[in-house]
Each structure stands twice: as C-alpha cells, then as structure tokens.
C-alpha cells in the first residue's frame, strides 16, 4: 500500500498558487506524485508523475472554489487522493507592496506600487482585482517603539513637518476594507530628514 502525501496545503501569494506537500516515508523506493484540479466535473492532470513535492496552479481562475487533489505513486500502485479546496480571490495572501521614498527637507514623499500578479500583464496588479484596495502606512522614529498609522487616499502620501535631521522608518501594506483583510507589510525603509524648510523671520 502506497501512503498518501502528507501536509498537503496551498501556498498562494498574489495568485501564485503553489500546491505543496511532503513525501511520506516509503521503504520500497522513490515516490512520484500526480496533482489534478476539478474542471467541469472532470479531474484534469496538472502535474503528472513528478518527483517534486509541489505543483503550480497559478492558471486557475481567480474566482470560485477549486478542488485540487494529489496522490503518491510507485510503479503501478498509488495512494488514495488527498483533496483540498481553494478559492484564490479569498485565500491568496496579499504580498507586500513596493514603495519609493524620497526626502524633501522635513518631509517624506512616498509612492506605493500594488503587488504584481502571477500570470498577468505587467500593469494588472492586485489593485485591479480588489475594488476596495487601499494602503495602510505605518511610520515611526527610528529607535522608538511608538508607531503611527495612516490610510492614504491615493497611491502616494507625504509625511510633513517631521523633526529635522531625524531618521524615520516607513512600511506599507495592502488592505481590503470590504473583506477586513490585510496584506503583508513591506520591509521598512528608513530615511533621515534634513533641515526644516521654514525660514526664520
């Protein structure tokens, strides 16, 4: 009897949908695996007789509950199927946005870039998929614990009237208010402000 794949799960970030599993212990030799998806009531092969322990399902439609399954095989024997259900638009993890930061005197000027999507045109981003897409920004003085959060209305934001000659750190994430779903934070970007622009009288 061939044991089934273990720890079968979907790892999906920005609609890059990778079904992953672990190979079970099997004394007779090396196992191969076949992964399938349900399409119009028929299971279709996606990865056949692969020695890998993952299979890319990024070409699935973004909407709908998809049934995926994987089994282990050895010679002419095979395990039972292990099934999972996956809805990309609900289940995919929102990866960190890009961010460009520029210091202008005592201000930080930030521009945000929505994450790109696997199997899409360069310009079709997570912002196109989710109508309610917005950004959360948090910033803090480097070396302090107190963080401030803002929700920009656009793809850019300016933090004004900051302390001069002070290093501020900023990070951004995508947020979907209608789903109350937050994405992953970007890596912090830390920049030092320069002089105060105000001219003494």
């Amino acid at each position: 009897m061939v044991p089934p794949p273990e720890n079968v799960r979907m790892n999906s970030v920005n609609f890059k949908n990778i079904l992953q599993w672990e190979s079970p212990a099997f004394a007779k030799g090396n196992l191969t695996f076949t992964a399938q998806y349900l399409s119009y009531r028929i299971f279709q092969d996606k990865c056949m007789n692969t020695t890998l322990t993952e299979c890319d399902f990024s070409s699935l439609s973004k909407y709908g509950d998809h049934t995926l399954r994987v089994r282990a095989e050895f010679a002419d024997e095979h395990s039972d199927w292990v099934n999972i259900t996956f809805c990309p638009v609900d289940d995919t993890i929102i990866g960190p946005p890009g961010m460009q930061v520029e210091v202008l005197a005592d201000s930080l000027h930030m521009r945000f870039l929505a994450p790109k999507i696997e199997n899409e045109y360069e310009t079709w981003t997570m912002k196109n998929v989710y109508n309610s897409w917005t950004y959360n920004v948090q910033y803090w003085k480097n070396g302090t614990d107190e963080k401030f959060q803002i929700t920009p209305q656009y793809d850019f934001e300016v933090l004004r009237n900051l302390e001069p000659w002070t290093t501020y750190c900023v990070q951004v994430r995508g947020f979907l208010p209608d789903r109350n779903k937050a994405g992953e934070w970007s890596e912090p970007v830390c920049e030092q402000t320069t002089h105060d622009e105000t001219v003494p009288s």
Epitope: S59, L60, S61, K62, Y63, V89, N119, E120, Y121, T123, W124, N128, V129, N131
Partner: nanobody, 124 residues
Framework: EVQLVESGGGLVQPGGSLRLSCAAS????????IGWFRQAPGKGLEGVSC????????HYADSVKGRFTISRDNSKNTVYLQMNSLRAEDTAVYYC?????????????????WGQGTQVTVSS
Amino acid sequence: EVQLVESGGGLVQPGGSLRLSCAASGNSLDYPTIGWFRQAPGKGLEGVSCISASDGSTHYADSVKGRFTISRDNSKNTVYLQMNSLRAEDTAVYYCAASLLGLGCKSEADYDYWGQGTQVTVSS
C-alpha cells in the same frame, strides 16, 4: 446569454494595420473586463490585451505593446483592437472575451463569454 461577434480580420502585408471589432449583444460591455486573445496555428491561446470598465485602464502583452491599442465605444457596445506595424508572428485567430467579475485580464480562465474568432493573416 451574451453573444460576442468579432470582425475586421483579413490579409494584410507586414507593417500594415487592421482594426478588429468586438460587438456585444445586450449589455455585456457593462462587464468589468473585455479582453482580446489570439491563437496562432499549432499554438495555445495567448492573451493580447484587455480593457477595464471600472477605470478605463488598458493592459497589453509585451509582444504587442506600442503597436496595438484597445478601446471601447459604449454607445455602440463595441470594443476595438487597433493593430499597427503588423508582423508575420501576429498571424492568428483573434478572439474577444468578456469577464463577469473582472478579476483577471490575461488568463483565459478568468473569462466567461467568448466570440467565435476572426482570422488575421500577415503575409507579403
């Protein structure tokens, strides 16, 4: 049921232009995304371009960027694909498709309704 009808295909010399039309019955152009795809002989379906109803944004495959332009005329319920500087490798059957949810642009899996296609041949 939505019906999409493509027209405007034909034989054109390299460097020439064509304008494809995708006419829709009903209000299908209210759908969030309308896309153009093509299938060259012996090859799979390839995304070419799409237009989003929500913001009018247009999106293109790298292979056609700067040469093809997608647009829509809501009064005529029609989407157009203006194809300039055509090359032999643009030879294909071109299909338009409509998406109910508008979640995707390039992947055929994200579209719900399809036209029957129009042949474009680029040859001297």
